[in-house]
């Protein structure tokens, strides 16, 4: 990656990592506006299956593991990465270690939420305070989740599918900040693993994943007025272990595995024609990235 | 009845490479992590490499990082192994097997590797 | 790495005995412990898996335990088919080691 300055844009998404044949430290960010890619500061070491949030203009690269020809170590690191300087740097890591993490931001706080330390599956959330740079366990979930999609919707935290070391897990189940404690929600119709999981429009969406058979290109969303699940348009790739963010009222699926191969194509759903396209190729495939959007 | 059936053994010179083939029946192998172990004439079991079928992430012994590849081609429900730089030490016995929560609960019949000058 | 130390390395029974075959490992590996038994010739079978569950058509006479770090294969009434030998392995963390094995013979 690059050490210079970053040109200063508006929003971009930012895609971090990822695996393919081991794990990376690319950190890249493409413009929807223009269709170009910048590619910027290299992660301090290579992780994939992280998760990657923004909070005060900051983006944060959390969790993972370094998978390399010389080891495989999970991460319980936290890292910055200011894009006016384009450098990262450190922040004090979480409790454990957890890879295939999801993260959600509520208040300016940073949910790490299960994820893997070897073979333990984690219930366990952890919640990060930026000003203070600590980060504090609270109510653990009802179930272990690994590869699970992460998303916050009315300051309420929702962890949707993965899992679990024995089943991969259509459930899902809801964090109350407030009573510090979690509920279960209405299960997807599909068992998703590694799915891509986002908010558009007062709805949660659930896109590709693993079922324990096959990568998925369903995609599913949320209701959380009436409670249910209601299958929208498939992505055009089956995808699994991808990295999803919304941008200017659309999502934006980037990377993953099929099965055969690690996708470098970019789709992008438009919530009013319900349909998918391509809009973009990621300078490499690769799975296990993590992805967010900049704030303006 | 599920069956792992391992090919492309025999004897190559050091420095030489093989391909080994696992098919796969009676299950899936996009639904399982698949896994080579290898067993040296006389000695015990040590695993090589292994493959995640959610993620196609794969992993590996030591021994053998930077010279052998793992993948699987779900179109023929076969996995592979792909040996280069081969070392005289890397004679054994090579099985594929499935995993199963902490074990692994299908085996191939093995294929014999032999790597000498 | 996670060294898997098995013991006896060997053992002779006789057929009735109650064999006990321990893995002690380096540091903690959970519940994360498989029991194989392999026969000349022939590739490992699966006995148990996650320390202490009997894996699908396996005798019961056949049993796994976990204190702490240690493991133990405890066969309750030896047949004359279970002559063989025995490996432990752990699947906690990355990479899976196999503890040495233990020979099983006929007294």
């Known amino acids: 990656g690059s050490m210079g300055h970053a040109p200063k844009v508006g929003r971009l998404i930012y895609t971090a990592g990822g695996y393919f044949r081991q794990s990376l430290s690319y950190l890249e960010a493409y413009n929807p506006s223009d269709g170009t890619w910048l590619d910027l500061a290299d992660l301090q070491v290579p992780r994939s299956g992280l998760a990657g949030c923004v909070v005060g203009g900051l983006l944060y690269a959390v969790g993972g593991r370094n998978n390399s020809p010389d080891g495989n170590t999970d991460s319980s690191a936290l890292d910055c990465y200011n894009p006016m300087t384009n450098q990262w740097s450190p922040c004090a890591p979480m409790s454990v270690p957890r890879n295939r993490i999801g993260v959600g931001v509520i208040d300016g706080h940073i949910y790490a939420v299960g994820g893997s330390h070897g073979c333990i599956h984690h219930n366990s959330v952890e919640r990060y305070e930026p000003e203070r740079d600590e980060w504090h366990l609270v109510a653990p979930m009802l179930t272990r989740r690994i590869g699970v999609g992460v998303a916050v919707l009315n300051r309420l935290l929702y962890a949707v599918g993965g899992f679990d070391g024995t089943n991969r897990l259509n459930s899902a189940e809801c964090y109350y900040p407030e009573r510090n404690e979690w509920r279960m929600i209405t299960a997807m119709n599909t068992i998703r693993s590694g799915a891509g999981v986002c908010v558009l429009h007062n709805c949660i969406y659930a896109a590709g994943g693993y079922d324990g058979q096959d990568q998925l290109n369903s995609v599913e969303r949320y209701d959380v007025e009436t409670e249910t699940w209601t299958f929208v348009a498939p992505m055009k790739h089956r995808r699994s272990a991808l990295g999803i963010t919304v941008h200017q009222g659309r999502i934006y699926v980037l990377g993953g595995y099929d099965g055969h191969t690690f996708l470098d194509s970019v789709e992008c759903y438009d919530p009013d024609t319900d349909t998918w396209s391509e809009v973009t190729r990621m300078t490499s495939g690769r799975s296990g990235v993590g992805v967010a959007v900049t704030m303006e | 009845e599920v069956q792992l059936v391992e090919s492309g053994g025999g004897l190559v010179q050091p420095g030489g490479s093989l391909r080994l083939s696992c098919a796969a029946s009676?299950?899936?192998?996009?639904?399982?992590?698949i896994h080579w172990v290898r067993q040296a004439p006389g000695k015990g079991l040590e695993w090589v490499a292994s493959i995640d079928p959610e993620t196609g992430e794969t992993l590996y012994a030591k021994s053998v990082a930077g010279r052998f590849t793992i993948s699987a081609d779900t179109s023929k429900n076969t996995a592979y192994l792909q040996m280069n730089s081969l070392r005289a030490e890397d004679t054994a016995v090579y099985y594929c097997?499935?995993?199963?929560?902490?074990?692994?609960?299908?085996w191939g019949q093995g294929t014999l590797v032999t790597v000498s000058s | 790495d996670i060294q898997m130390t098995q013991s006896p390395s060997s053992l002779s029974a006789s057929v009735g005995d109650r064999v006990t075959i321990t893995c002690r490992a380096s540091q903690s590996v959970s519940s994360a412990v498989a029991w194989y038994q392999q026969k000349p010739g022939k590739a490992p079978k699966l006995l148990i898996y996650?320390?202490?569950s009997l894996y699908s058509g396996v005798p019961s006479r056949f049993s796994g335990s976990r204190s702490g770090t240690d493991f133990t294969l405890t066969i309750s009434s030896l047949q004359p088919e279970d002559f063989a030998t025995y490996y432990c392995?752990?699947?906690?963390?990355?990479?899976?080691?196999f503890g040495q094995g233990t020979k099983v013979e006929i007294k």
């Open positions: 392995q752990q699947s906690y963390s990355f990479p899976s080691t």
């Open positions: 009676g299950f899936a192998i996009s639904a399982s992590s």
């Open positions: 097997t499935r995993a199963h929560a902490y074990g692994l609960d299908y």
């Open positions: 996650s320390a202490s």
